[in-house]
Amino acid sequence: DNPERYSTNLSNHVDDFTTFRGTELSFLVTTHQPTNLVLPSNGSMHNYCPQQTKITSAFKYINTVISCTIFIVGMVGNATLLRIIYQNKCMRNGPNALIASLALGDLIYVVIDLPINVFKLLAGRWPFDHNDFGVFLCKLFPFLQKSSVGITVLNLCALSVDRYRAVASWSRVQGIGIPLVTAIEIVSIWILSFILAIPEAIGFVMVPFEYRGEQHKTCMLNATSKFMEFYQDVKDWWLFGFYFCMPLVCTAIFYTLMTCEMLNRRNGSLRIALSEHLKQRREVAKTVFCLVVIFALCWFPLHLSRILKKTVYNEMDKNRCELLSFLLLMDYIGINLATMNSCINPIALYFVSKKFKNCFQSCLCCCCYQSKSLMTSVPMNGTSIQWKNHDQNNHNTDRSSHKDSMN
């Protein structure tokens, strides 16, 4: 049924949308969006589009391979990232705490949701569909999907705000450790993500349906209240607005402010005194920006296919099959790219950050050890950390640089 992290209905029906997670509002068995499990009032099915079965069949196996790869890479990558940040005192700081939060959200999705999804894809049915555990999984699966993407989105926003704050608050002195404000941010992010995912847990139920006289059950969004009906109607736009546009707008705003701040401070002795400091913060900003760009690239195709499905596609149009083939293909590409986002951040950090690269290498070759050379010759932000220097300016600069130890 949702490799993608905001999929909803995870079953399919006998018509055009055999695996397209779109809205087809009066069909037998369903896919992505809420669908009533009855046929149209005239009692007949549309004739299906021939292309859809080819795309669906190919996708089933391609997606299984991709999902298994994402599961392994995501589990190893995110677990390693968490271990690096937990084990290395020098890595425990504001931005890295947010990155750890991001990794934990991805790890939860990868470990719990991906196996359910692969089972659904291969077996063609919901796991434990005839007992209470199946009902529990039906509510847990979309809840964790939404929570995970919410955690990703809000952490990216927090990282963007954090970068701006780091540049705006030049005088801030910070040693090793996670600042209280960051800890509060992380707790708030998780709470808010869980709250925003509650409608999924409420709305998703095991709905029985019949096919050729046989009784089946599928996990799907089934609106039973006015609020859930409203949620169902605005869902695609809400997902696009909050879970996609919002982090991009947030990054754009705070990065613009950060650039202005840096340009305003270009002249004077402070610039000279903080040149290394600026350099390393610029590097951290680049890393965060890189994570946001990757997020945007991973999620854009899926959101675009959703919006096109909502605005352009007409299920009653006799010439809909060509558009459907395009949307199906786009949806499947989007699903895989969106799922890939949950394993790509550790890879991105490995390539963008020297510090993380070294830690990854040593951690994956047994454990991430904190050697002297790592602390001095391979600086966290392009500068070595020299605790012995008692010059006041340097002292402040260096201590504050611990907040930015990513690169």
Epitope: Y48, K60, E210
Partner: antibody, heavy 116, light 112 residues
């Protein structure tokens, strides 16, 4: 023993109407989907209608859509096929069949001839 | 519509021989429930069709184990290991995954 009894068919003029019935016994009728399948004189089989266990959902191919209506009476364990605006190409042997993931049991058939 | 192509149209066999009938669908017929609704029916002269195999390879109750169904996606086969006199008739394949459900044109199994 599962039984699907179909009474004898008949000769109908083009444009005319006819209702076929299928009385069942030996199984829980309301637990099965039901279908009507026809076989042309050329021995070609065509599914013409299906109905869900509770009768809420019915499906028809384009060739009969709007002309044929499938219905069921679970209390009487009987299946019906109402045929209107009959054409010469509707001439066939009509079979009722039980549906439970496949058409497991079939009636003996009712011959329908549409001719002027 | 999904076109079901059966080969051969006629299959002359000697009693005790193995018979193999092929059925190819114009589209993949795996249904979204995970099932492939591919069935084989046998119609003996003067009788109504009888279900032999359902969901590609499952024998219906009372069907001898000399009947074996196999295949996936678009290619399906019915094999009769040792043909007996009571096996003679027309064999039809049928797909019930995509509406309108369709039958193959039939394969007549006859004595050589």
């Amino acid at each position: 023993e599962v039984q699907l009894q179909q009474p004898g068919g008949g000769l109908v003029q083009p444009g005319g109407s006819l209702t076929l019935s299928c009385a069942t016994s030996g199984f829980t009728f309301s637990s099965y989907g039901m279908s009507w399948v026809r076989q042309t004189p050329a021995k070609r089989l065509e599914l013409v209608a299906t109905i869900s266990t509770n009768g809420a959902t019915a499906n028809y191919p384009d060739s009969v859509k709007g002309r044929f209506t499938i219905s069921r009476d679970n209390a009487k364990s009987t299946l019906y096929l109402q045929m209107r605006s009959l054409k010469s190409e509707d001439t066939a042997m009509y079979y009722c069949a039980t549906e439970k993931g496949a058409m497991g049991y079939w009636g003996q058939g009712t011959s329908v001839t549409v001719s002027s | 519509d999904v076109l079901m192509t059966q080969t051969p149209l006629s299959l002359p066999v000697s009693l005790g021989d193995q018979a193999s009938i092929s059925c190819r669908s114009s589209q993949n017929i795996v249904h979204s429930t995970g099932n492939t609704y591919l069935e084989w029916y046998l119609q003996k002269p003067g009788q109504s069709p009888k279900l032999l195999i359902y969901k590609v390879s499952n024998r219906f109750s009372g069907v001898p184990n000399r009947f074996r169904g196999s295949g996936s996606g678009t290619d399906f086969t019915l094999k009769i290991t040792r043909v007996e006199a009571e096996d003679l008739g027309i064999y039809y394949c049928f797909q019930g995954s995509h509406f309108p459900f369709t039958f193959g044109s039939g394969t007549k199994l006859e004595i050589k």
